[in-house]
Every structure is written in structure tokens, then in C-alpha cells.
Interface confidence: low
């Protein structure tokens, strides 16, 4: 048999809180347990679900959980079924609602001296206790002119008068908690003695020294009083005006007139209406002084013909908002067409050259008018006045290539040489009119040149080929003074170029013919074996038909090249002793000898008392010091050639003789001893 060990029991529960209906069974075989609510099976949800054989509630719901719950145990094998005792919840709850008009049927029917009933739609279990409020102040039962029916949840006002006007709200509390009305009710019962607005003053914007009018009217029985105040609560009447409102007039109908308005009159004006009963009604209006700021200067604009462009006129700040319009040549622009105004923009569609000129943006309001000009230039594509021509330019002379164009604005001209931009330097100069000047034409200037003339509207270009007319010249010019080594073979070259290949020949300056051992081979003078007589002046002559001839004079010297008879040797000297570095050279012309020590030439006139250079070329250094150590170079030179040889000088301390060494022991290295 199935036995219930624990049965569900009825219990109190709180709306939205947890709860548990317990059920435990014992049976000989397996049973399954399910729950019934008012006889219907309970389906599991996230809120309400079986927990073992008990039924768990995550949040009790007064609507879904009202009724009788029963736990059922069933043995599916035997078909035996057992049901628990019934259990239900006593759910405690409270729920907010609005304050509504119960009587009369509509707000339109509310009149002074009628009964008005309001209902508080807050409900709950157990039944809550109600509290009413007017404008946030609690109303207690039994107060004059109203009754509160807690059972009916009603507030009755009998008779209702203007003093009952206000915002009605209610709150209710019970064992479960508290709630206040979700929507309140405004009761408005007119009182003829209260001031009511007939005409409210409006904000006014006026120009300086103009007049301003504020209208203000109230009605009541008996008629209300009216008072004007300015900013700092200063009253304005026809009898007592504040110093800064001397030109203020208050009319019988309540209107306020201000004449010759000045900046100090701007501000907030308050119109106050006071009935025999009820609160004062305060209406505000502001007097603004019209103003308009200056407009800053426009940047000039450059446009291209055929394009569409817009120029925006940023309106100046002003009160009231300034109106903006564009003019050209004194005529206001239309709102459509080819050149027109759109909003604050000047629009130029399919721009023509004739559109160039000054356009004016105007802005105006009560405070005045502002204007600003914009200068519009219509750029045109350059046209040719003179294109660059294929040209023959003479080498060594200035050359010119024209590139003359016209356009608006003035075109910019750039030149290219072999597709490379020419930057102005000492050789190239571009004149203001576009002409290119090559200051000194060189052979390699013979190539293609291209000029490009541009404006924002576009560019044109043309090219020309330059042919350089080469001048007759030596390439390179022969050295005017040359040396040949005696008894050796020698050559003296001479070459030249010109528009036609020149003929080159050598002759002696005195006109005498060349000896038979000297040959002139295509401009190269060849000496098979140089003799003393070969020295002298020679002339190289280059000539061609169109350019005539040029001459180069060469003085040839015959020399015996320098050799060293004596060369300086590696030398080590004791400190304080004398060093001798020998050097002798021979050659013709007789060579002169110079010494270089420590990377500087030793000037014989500035050697000082310790150093001396002998006539044969040897160098003597007395009283040597460690700083004299280093490499010394003997340089021999004459008008034909120069040779040098070098040797190191070491300066060392004199060793102190040891006892083991005999007095005749030699030093450990080669020495000069003095």
C-alpha cells in the first residue's frame, strides 16, 4: 500500500516570494508522484516545478497559484493511486493603481459647490488601509468638507470648492507592504476671484533706439491688480520708474511700452497678476536687443571655366537670425539659373570667363546690414603666342627657346630637358614671359626641350629640338708647358673637334721644320729619342673649312729626371745627441731639396737653432728630444718632376751601463754618437 509520510498543508505566502508544498510517500514498489491544481495536472515551469516529490515555487503568483493543490502517488505496475490532503495558499499582496474620478462622470461636469468623489485603485490582500494626499499633504478623515471611506477606497469632497484644487494622490499599506498611486488626479475648480491669464507677454527683439511693447492681461472678479517688474525686481509704474527705465509707460490695459531702447533695457520683464484670492500669477518675457556681428574677409577664389563651384557665405551671428543674400554688379542673385543662390551658397554652374568679378555676400537683420566681397577669377587654359622652335645654338654662347602663352591668371611655365624638369641654376634661367635661356651652350645641350604652360584650368605643351653648333676647339687644350725625359721616347698629343673634323698639325714656333726623328702623326708629336735640341716652343694648329684655324702654343723642356744619390736611412739617436739624415739628389734642371717632418714641411727660414739643412740637402737636428721622433721625408723637385724618399728617426734614452758589461760593449742597436 502507498503511504504519505509528509502531506502538503495550507499556508500563508507572500506575492513574488518562495514557497514549498511538501509531499513524501512510501510504497513497496516504484511509484511516480505528480501534482494537481484544482484537479488538473501541474506542468513544470521555471517559476513552479517539482523538486523530488515536493512542489517548489520560485515566486508565488496570486493569480496562477490560487486554488487547491493535491499530491498524487501512483504505482504504474499495480495501478494503485493515493491522493494527499488538499492544500492552498493564503497569498498576501498589494498592487498600485491610479486615482480616478468616480463622481461626477467627467471632469467637465465639476463645478464649484458640487460633490466630487475620487477612488484609489490600490488593491491587496489582506485589504490595505488607505491614506489620501493633496499636493503632498496628508488628508485626515473627518476634516472639514471631505470624508474618507476606507472600505470604498473613496475620498468625497462635499461641497467641492476652489480651496480643494490640487494634485490628489493616495497610498495604501497592509501586512504585505505599501504602495502609492501610479497616476494622480489634478482637481481644478475655478474661483472667480482668482487671477486668470488672458494675454501673456511674448519675447521681443528690437533694434537699438526703437520701441518695444509687452502685452499682459489678467481677469478675475473683482478685477485683479497688475504689476510690472524688471530684472532686479524693480517695480515699473507711471509714477515711479527706475533710472534706467525713464522711457517706460504702463497702459490701463496692462501693456508696457519702452521707447528708445538701449542695451541696459535688455533683460527679463515680469508681469504679476493678483486676484482677491489665490496665488499671484507671474509671467515672464525677455527683451533682446537686435545685434549683428561683422563678417570677416573672404579669400579670393580662382575657378576654371566649365566647372561648377560654390562659395559659402558663413552668416554672421545675430539676433534675430540674419537673412543672407548674394549680389553681383549691384544685382541680387536669383534662386535658380546658371549663377544663383542656394541657401547661403553662391553657385556658379558651367562657369564662363564673364563670371569673373566681385561678388558680395550681404547679411541683414533688425540691427543692420553687413557685407563682404569675394574676388572671383575665372582661369582659362593657356593659348600660344609663340611656341618653341627647333633651333641651332652656338656652343659657348647664350641660347634662347621661346614659350610665350597667355591666360588668366598668368600661366606658370616649366621646362623639361630629356623629360627631366629643368631647375633654375647658373646655366638655366626661365624668364617671366616663359622664355628659357641657356647661359653658355654646351655640346651635350643638343637634345629635346619641352615647355609646359599651366593655369588651374589646364595646360598646353610643345617641344623643340636643339642642335648645338660646335665651336672649333682643342679637346683637351694641350698643356702649355711640358717636360720630356732626356734620351727617352716621348709623345705630345693634340686633338680638336669642330662642326667638321679638323686637320691637326704641329710646327716649331720659329717656323722651322721638325727634325727627321720627330714625327707628327694625326696630331701626336712623337720624339723617337729626346735630345737637348728638342727643347723649345711648338705650335699645334687645328683647322677646318667653315671655321678657320686655332692654335695652341706648347713650351717643351728637356730634362734629366730626378734620382737620389744618397737616401736617408732608419736612424736611432740618444736623447740630447745630434741626428744626421742624409739626402742628395741629381737631375737636370738641378733639383731643390725640401724636408717634411711630422707631416709638415720644414721651412728653412723658420727651423730655429736646433735644425739645419745643408746645401747638399742633408738635415741635421741637434740636441734631439723624444718629440723629434717620427718619419722624415726628403722631397726633391725641379720644374719637370718631383720625387721623395723617407726614413724614420727614433730618439731613445741613453742606457745606464751595468757592471757585467764591459766598457767597450756595443749598444743594442745602430746609433749615431756625437
Amino acid at each position: 500500500a502507498i503511504v504519505f509520510i509528509k502531506q502538503p498543508s495550507s499556508q500563508d505566502a507572500l506575492q513574488g516570494r518562495r514557497a514549498l508544498l511538501r509531499c513524501e510517500v512510501e510504497a513497496p514498489g516504484p511509484v511516480h508522484v505528480y501534482w494537481l491544481l484544482d484537479g488538473a495536472p501541474v506542468q513544470d515551469t521555471e517559476r513552479r516545478f517539482a523538486q523530488g516529490s515536493s512542489l517548489s515555487f520560485a515566486a508565488v503568483d496570486r493569480l496562477q497559484d490560487s486554488g487547491t493543490f493535491q499530491c498524487v502517488a501512483r504505482d504504474d505496475v499495480t495501478g494503485e493511486e493515493a491522493r494527499s490532503a488538499n492544500a492552498s495558499f493564503n497569498i498576501k499582496w498589494i498592487e498600485a493603481g491610479p486615482v480616478v474620478l468616480k463622481h461626477p462622470a467627467s471632469e467637465a461636469e465639476i463645478q464649484p459647490q458640487t460633490q466630487v468623489t475620487l477612488r484609489c485603485h490600490i488593491d491587496g490582500h489582506p485589504r490595505p488601509t488607505y491614506q489620501w494626499f493633496r499636493d503632498g499633504t496628508p488628508l485626515s478623515d473627518g476634516q472639514s468638507n471631505h470624508t474618507v471611506s476606507s472600505k470604498e477606497r473613496n475620498l468625497t469632497l462635499r461641497p467641492a470648492g476652489p480651496e480643494h484644487s490640487g494634485l490628489y494622490s493616495c497610498c495604501a499599506h497592509s501586512a504585505f507592504g505599501q504602495a502609492c498611486s501610479s497616476q494622480n488626479f489634478t482637481l481644478s475648480i475655478a474661483d472667480e476671484s482668482f487671477a486668470r491669464v488672458v494675454l501673456a507677454p511674448q519675447d521681443v527683439v528690437v533694434a537699438r533706439y526703437e520701441e518695444a511693447m509687452f502685452h499682459c492681461q489678467f481677469s478675475a472678479q473683482p478685477p485683479p491688480s497688475l504689476q510690472w517688474l524688471f530684472e532686479d525686481e524693480t517695480p515699473i509704474t507711471n509714477r515711479s520708474r527706475p533710472p534706467h527705465l525713464r522711457r517706460a509707460t504702463v497702459f490701463a490695459n496692462g501693456s508696457l511700452l519702452l521707447t528708445q531702447v538701449r542695451p541696459r533695457n535688455a533683460g527679463i520683464y515680469r508681469c504679476i497678476g493678483q486676484g482677491q484670492r489665490g496665488p499671484p500669477i507671474i509671467l515672464e518675457a525677455t527683451l533682446h536687443l537686435a545685434e549683428i556681428e561683422d563678417m570677416p574677409l573672404f579669400e579670393p577664389r580662382v575657378f576654371t571655366a566649365g566647372s561648377e563651384e560654390r562659395v559659402t557665405c558663413l552668416p554672421p551671428k545675430g539676433l534675430p537670425e540674419p537673412s543672407v543674400w548674394w549680389e553681383h554688379a549691384g544685382v541680387r542673385l536669383p534662386t535658380h539659373g546658371r549663377v544663383y543662390q542656394k541657401g547661403h551658397e553662391l553657385v556658379l554652374a558651367n562657369i564662363a570667363e564673364s563670371d569673373a568679378g566681385v561678388y558680395t555676400c550681404h547679411a541683414a537683420n533688425l540691427a543692420g546690414q553687413r557685407r563682404q566681397d569675394v574676388n572671383i577669377t575665372v582661369a582659362t587654359v593657356p593659348s600660344w603666342l609663340k611656341k618653341p622652335q627647333d633651333s641651332q645654338l652656338e656652343e659657348g654662347k647664350p641660347g634662347y627657346l621661346d614659350c610665350l602663352t597667355q591666360a588668366t591668371p598668368k600661366p606658370t611655365v616649366v621646362w623639361y630637358r630629356n623629360q627631366m624638369l629643368i631647375s633654375e641654376d647658373s646655366r638655366f634661367e626661365v624668364f617671366k614671359n616663359g622664355t628659357l635661356r641657356i647661359n653658355s651652350v654646351e655640346v651635350y645641350d643638343g637634345t629635346w626641350y619641352r615647355c609646359m604652360s599651366s593655369t588651374p584650368a589646364g595646360s598646353i605643351e610643345a617641344q623643340a629640338r636643339v642642335q648645338v653648333l660646335e665651336k672649333l676647339k682643342f679637346t683637351p687644350p694641350p698643356q702649355p708647358q711640358q717636360c720630356m725625359e732626356f734620351d727617352k721616347e716621348a709623345t705630345v698629343p693634340c686633338s680638336a673637334t669642330g662642326r667638321e673634323k679638323p686637320t691637326i698639325k704641329w710646327e716649331r714656333a720659329d717656323g722651322s721644320s721638325l727634325p727627321e726623328w720627330v714625327t707628327d702623326n694625326a696630331g701626336t708629336l712623337h720624339f723617337a729619342r729626346v735630345t737637348r735640341d728638342d727643347a723649345g716652343n711648338y705650335t699645334c694648329i687645328a683647322s677646318n673649312g667653315p671655321q678657320g684655324q686655332i692654335r695652341a702654343h706648347v713650351q717643351l723642356t728637356v730634362a734629366v729626371f730626378i734620382t737620389f744619390k744618397v737616401e736617408p736611412e732608419r736612424t736611432t739617436v740618444y736623447q740630447g745627441h745630434t741626428a744626421l739624415l742624409q739626402c742628395e739628389a741629381q737631375g737636370d734642371p738641378k733639383p731643390l731639396i725640401q724636408w717634411k717632418g711630422k707631416d709638415r714641411i720644414l721651412d728653412p727660414t723658420k727651423l730655429g737653432p736646433r735644425m739645419h739643412i745643408f746645401q747638399n740637402g742633408s738635415l741635421v737636428i741637434h740636441d734631439v728630444a723624444p718629440e723629434d721622433s717620427g718619419r722624415y721625408t726628403c722631397i726633391a723637385g725641379n720644374s719637370c718632376n718631383i720625387k721623395h724618399t723617407e726614413a724614420p728617426l727614433y730618439v731613445v734614452d741613453k742606457p745606464v751601463p751595468e757592471e757585467s758589461e764591459g766598457p767597450g760593449s756595443p749598444p743594442p742597436y745602430k746609433m749615431i754618437q756625437t
Partner: antibody, heavy 120, light 113 residues
Framework: QVQLQESGPGLVKPSQTLSLTCTVS??????????WSWIRQHPGKGLEWIGY???????YYTPSLKSRITISVDTSENQFSLKLNSVTAADTAVYYC????????????WGKGTTVTVSS | DIVMTQSPDSLAVSLGERATIDCKSS????????????LAWYQQKPGQPPKLIIY???TRESGVPDRFSGSGSGTDFTLTITSLQAEDVAIYYC?????????FGGGTKVEIK
């Protein structure tokens, strides 16, 4: 790099006309986009703007000098000029030419200035 | 005309210290529609023309050291040299370019203390 160079006589006699020229180099004077100004500085004093010209010839002169002043332009020579009539000792000053950028009228390039003395 | 008033007339500041120059315009030079202040600052050394250092009240001209800065709006502006160097000794001028005639301040001479 645009450069400006003022030129003109350093000494002018009273009641005569002061004439100065400003040569613009290193840039295209007539490509638009700049106003070309004259400014002067009396000895030991501050700067006084005289007027400007656009390459197309549009001018604006400071009101105090308007009756005596003419600013003109020669686009072919990349030059603009200042003429000031009926000079007095009060016109003795260093005169500068300058470039004002794109209608925003701050002077971003100045000439070195030339001293003009009005004396008999 | 818009009158530009600079203060002080002269200013002596130690090397490495901050120098501050004020400039007041008689009219607003802030244009509300683009929120730009039409004001520039120039530096003039003896025997030289003025050199533009700040425009739009706070934008540094290229090549001007970042120790120079401009601030302010409407009618009140300031030029600040945060750490004065010997080469900053000069007269400084403000200039409005809101409307013609263009007008300059009277100048402020900055010296080393």
C-alpha cells in the same frame, strides 16, 4: 621660396610724392590667392597697415591715408607699387611690403624694408 | 576700426623662465560661424622685418619652436614663451585680420633680466 624686395628713393622732399616698388621673386605673383600689402613703421614705433592690392587690381586703403595713397600692380614685372602724395615729416618711416595669405590677411612673407626720410 | 591693446609695454624675464604677453581687441574677433579667432602674433628683432609666429590665435607657423604658444578667444589673447632663450629677445606684436583696416597692437618689448 617667395621673396619680396622694396626699392625706391630713401629721401623725399616735403609736399612731394613718395614712390616705392616691391618686386616679388621665387613665385608666381599673378596666380591669385594672395593680397599684397604695404605696412610702415615710424622710428621707434609700432606697425601701421597702409593697404593691399590683389593681382587683378582690387585695392583697399587704410581710411587715414585713403586720400593720399595709390597702390598699383604690374603683373608682367611681378611688381606692385605704393605712391603717397603730399608727404610730410610724419611720413618718415621704414616701409615694408608683405604677402597676406588667402584672404586671411596675416602676413606670412615680408620684405626687408626700406627707410624713407621726408626732409628738405 | 578695431583697436588692439597690448600689455605690458616691456617685459624682463630670466633665461629659461616663462614670458606672457596679453593682447585685447576692442571688438570680438571670433567668428561664430567657423569658430576661428582672426588674430596673429609677430616677432620683430632689431633691424629686421616682423616674422609671423602664430595665426588663428593658436596655430604655430612652421619652423617656429614649440616654446611659443598662443591662446585666448573673442577679445582677450595671450602669447606665451614657456622657456625664454637669448634669441627670443625682440618686440612682439599682435594683429587682427577680422576686418579692414588691419590693425596691430602697440608691441611688447621682451628682454633678459
Amino acid at each position: 621660396q617667395v621673396q619680396l624686395q622694396e626699392s625706391g628713393p630713401g629721401l623725399v622732399k616735403p609736399s612731394q610724392t613718395l614712390s616705392l616698388t616691391c618686386t616679388v621673386s621665387g613665385g608666381s605673383f599673378s596666380s591669385g590667392g594672395y593680397y599684397w600689402s604695404w605696412i610702415r613703421q615710424h622710428p621707434g614705433k609700432g606697425l601701421e597697415w597702409i593697404g593691399y592690392i590683389y593681382y587683378s587690381g582690387t585695392t583697399y586703403y587704410t581710411p587715414s591715408l585713403k586720400s593720399r595713397i595709390t597702390i598699383s600692380v604690374d603683373t608682367s614685372e611681378n611688381q606692385f607699387s605704393l605712391k603717397l602724395n603730399s608727404v610730410t615729416a610724419a611720413d618718415t618711416a621704414v616701409y615694408y611690403c608683405a604677402r597676406a595669405g588667402f584672404g586671411y590677411y596675416y602676413m606670412d612673407v615680408w620684405g626687408k624694408g626700406t627707410t624713407v626720410t621726408v626732409s628738405s | 576700426d578695431i583697436v588692439m591693446t597690448q600689455s605690458p609695454d616691456s617685459l624682463a624675464v630670466s633665461l629659461g623662465e616663462r614670458a606672457t604677453i596679453d593682447c585685447k581687441s576692442s571688438q570680438n574677433v571670433l567668428y561664430s560661424s567657423n569658430n576661428k579667432n582672426y588674430l596673429a602674433w609677430y616677432q620683430q628683432k632689431p633691424g629686421q622685418p616682423p616674422k609671423l609666429i602664430i595665426y588663428w590665435a593658436s596655430t604655430r607657423e612652421s619652423g617656429v619652436p614649440d616654446r611659443f604658444s598662443g591662446s585666448g578667444s573673442g577679445t582677450d589673447f595671450t602669447l606665451t614663451i614657456t622657456s625664454l632663450q637669448a634669441e627670443d629677445v625682440a618686440i612682439y606684436y599682435c594683429q587682427q585680420y577680422y576686418s579692414t583696416p588691419l590693425t596691430f597692437g602697440g608691441g611688447t618689448k621682451v628682454e633678459i633680466k
